[in-house]
């Protein structure tokens, strides 16, 4: 007779990351009897929802249900039917919805209301949709990467089970770049966090952490580009904007109404004598870098030191995981290797931006032109943000690790969010630790 496998005693959780440019659904799985162990939760699926971010549905809220269908149906397939009713579903919306809320609380609520009604139609245990704060986004990203790196585990190992592990309990800082905001989160070294808004206290697995975090709204890569265009068109002599952040030969028409649609460009808004203008790429890294630096106000700092725009930033400490768009952009540019110095990254960006647009299109024929056209800007922006914004140096660059996944789970805020909401990170170290996969018997 054939042995029947015992049914796995596992649990599942679903988190939807409703970002400014798109929504992704993540499915997590963990052994039911090891809920309080560190590192046992892992991602089993990521489903990218086709279409833009939910904030773009403000004029067509009736389409939200259809928009979410494919990924929710995928979740239905991946998670065993017997587990559906006890699988929690959370949706967290980030900076795209924060911006919409700044424009209109009513419109933001209307979008979330339809999202909630749509998600309630599935057989899972829907726990609500909300706009998370920038502070939460930073904190949960920090929890995610340190949880996956095993930094909260009190077991010392003579071997490494995860990449980047330095075999100590020193946590990694988290650098997250989205379309509409960017977050920096880390434990400073014996430094008072001078601004209370940027201070977080955690007790995780019996250890206290004093964490610095800040989310820069409007400094995600997409909104930063809108800001730069709005700033530069102010001084353009006509409806042609010669832009160093786009490849030579690149041309694109932009509607002024689209440029001023976002609250991020309000500070640059002016009455222009034209309704449209044309971007003409000239592909010059150095000039692009200079233009981007004008978005960072470094002239004012009410603290001992600042990042930019008068925001306190303690001295950088330890290693950092840079994920989300930091990783996607650098991966595309083939600049994620630990061996590539900051000087080399800059050199490669200079070469990349100077390449003619026709040549770029041929070399990357499979990439959508909308995305392809913006890698020169995005790569330059990442360098500007990390070096001039956050004060990384050529020396400390080696402490930045561009991370897509850790142990098969995406780096990002969603895992930390779920761990927190399902109470899976205990404040105290569990008394007895069951044998885990990293223990030899």
């Amino acid at each position: 007779t054939q042995n029947k496998a015992l049914p796995e005693n596992v649990k599942y959780g679903i988190v939807l990351d409703a970002g400014s440019s798109h929504t992704s659904l993540y499915i997590y799985k963990w052994p039911a009897e090891k809920e309080n162990d560190t590192g046992v939760v892992h991602q089993v699926e990521e489903c990218r929802v086709k279409g833009p971010g939910i904030s773009k549905f403000v004029q067509k809220v009736n389409e939200i249900g259809i928009y979410l269908t494919d990924c929710m149906e995928r979740a239905r397939e991946v998670i065993p039917r017997s587990q559906h009713q006890e699988t929690p579903v959370y949706l967290g919306a980030t900076a795209g919805m924060r911006l919409l809320r700044m424009e209109s609380e009513e419109l933001a609520d209307r979008v979330l209301d339809v999202v909630e009604r749509s998600l309630s139609n599935y057989p899972f245990d829907f726990q609500g949709a909300r706009i998370i704060t920038g502070q939460e986004e930073g904190a949960y990203g920090w929890i995610t990467i340190n949880y996956l790196l095993g930094k909260f585990s009190q077991k010392t190992r003579w071997f490494s089970i995860v990449p980047y592990e330095t075999n100590n309990q020193e946590t990694f800082g988290a650098l997250d770049l989205g379309g509409a905001s960017t977050q920096v989160t880390f434990v400073p070294q014996n430094q008072t966090i001078e601004s209370p808004d940027n201070a977080l206290q955690f007790r995780l697995y019996g250890k206290d952490y004093n964490v610095y975090t800040h989310s820069f709204l409007c400094y995600g890569k997409d909104q930063a580009l809108w800001q730069k265009l709005a700033k530069d068109i102010q001084v353009a002599s006509n409806e042609i904007l010669r832009d160093p952040c786009f490849h030579p030969g690149y041309k694109k028409v932009v509607n002024v109404s689209d440029l001023y649609k976002t609250p991020c460009t309000k500070r640059f808004e002016m009455t222009l004598p034209f309704q449209q203008f044309e971007i003409q790429g000239i592909g010059n890294y150095q000039q692009c870098h200079q233009s981007i630096l004008e978005l960072f106000n470094t002239s004012y700092c009410p603290y001992s030191q600042c990042a930019f725009n008068g925001i306190f930033l303690p001295p950088l400490q330890g290693d950092f995981g840079a994920f989300s768009a930091f990783y996607f952009v650098m991966k595309f540019l083939n600049l994620t290797s630990e061996k590539v110095s900051q000087e080399k990254v800059t050199e490669m960006m200079k070469k990349f931006c100077a390449q003619p647009w026709e040549e770029i299109k041929t070399s990357y024929a499979g990439v959508k032109e909308k995305y392809l056209s913006e890698y020169c800007f995005s790569g330059t922006y990442i360098l500007s943000l990390l070096l001039q914004g956050y004060h990384f140096t050529a020396d400390s660059w080696e402490h930045i690790h561009f991370i897509g996944k850790i142990q098969g789970s995406d780096a990002g805020w969603t895992l930390g969010y779920m761990l927190n909401l399902t109470n899976m990170i205990p404040a105290e170290q569990p008394l007895s630790t069951p044998l885990s996969h990293s223990t030899y018997v």
Epitope: Q59, E105, L107, P263
Partner: antibody, heavy 117, light 110 residues
Framework: EQQLVESGGGLVQPGGSLRLSCAVS????????ISWVRQAPGKGLEYIGI???????YYANWAKGRFTISKDSSKNTVYLQMGSLRAEDMAVYFC???????????WGPGTLVTVSS | DIVMTQSPDSLAVSLGERATINCQSS????????LSWFQQKPGQPPKLLIY???TLESGVPDRFSGSGSGTDFTLTISSLQAEDVAVYYC??????????FGGGTKVEIK
């Protein structure tokens, strides 16, 4: 069934202060926008301000500084604190759930504030 | 400051006839369509009739309709009934969580 009821209106002297309450039931304050609107006797509707689901507040330019909106979600109540009251502040004060989309039963009946010496 | 100008101030229309009320905003409303119309009867709070410039609130008779975009909007009562006697207000929603009511239009039977 959702319901909003204003209270706290009455007679106040010029220069005085008053706090109006808006008690809500049938829905969660933590997920709702509440607005305050007033109407002077025989006059039109005038927007005062709103408090968002996250607690953010926004005001009409004329109301900034003198009027403050707050809420206590545990008591299901939103407040309108009014200071330096003048004769022209005499009106019926309404609270509403939302504003542009304030559907059926989304408005309270109103509370009258009289400013007089 | 944003100014919402509503016209006429008052309107007398025969039963069964069409009534038209206009609202003009000093700046474009959010998304060009964030405009609502309210009906208010004496001693009552306002009642929502139309939102998104042209969407009829549920339970509102279809003789009420709204049109317009950007800065110019119209409320039409296609066939005035006795119960439609009231004051009508437009309300615009603007970028930055700003709002402005029109001055109101009193509708009476001729």
């Amino acid at each position: 069934e959702q319901q909003l009821v204003e209270s706290g209106g009455g007679l106040v002297q010029p220069g005085g202060s008053l706090r109006l309450s808006c008690a809500v039931s049938g829905f969660s304050l933590s997920k709702s926008i509440i607005s305050w609107v007033r109407q002077a006797p025989g006059k039109g509707l005038e927007y005062i301000g709103i408090i968002g689901s996250s607690g953010s507040t926004y005001y009409a330019n004329w109301a900034k500084g003198r009027f403050t909106i707050s809420k206590d979600s545990s008591k299901n109540t939103v407040y309108l604190q009014m200071g330096s009251l003048r004769a022209e502040d005499m009106a019926v004060y309404f609270c509403a759930r939302g504003l542009l989309y304030s559907g059926n039963k989304s408005w309270g009946p109103g509370t009258l504030v009289t400013v007089s010496s | 400051d944003i100014v919402m100008t509503q016209s006429p101030d008052s309107l007398a229309v025969s039963l069964g006839e069409r009534a038209t009320i206009n609202c003009q905003s000093s700046q474009s409303v959010l998304l060009n369509n964030q405009l609502s119309w309210f009906q208010q009867k004496p001693g009552q709070p306002p009642k929502l009739l139309i939102y998104d410039a042209s969407t009829l609130e549920s339970g509102v008779p279809d003789r009420f309709s709204g049109s317009g975009s950007g800065t110019d909007f119209t409320l039409t009562i296609s066939s005035l009934q006795a119960e439609d006697v009231a004051v009508y207000y437009c309300l615009g929603g603007y970028s930055g969580n700003l709002y402005a009511f029109g001055g109101g239009t009193k509708v009476e039977i001729k």
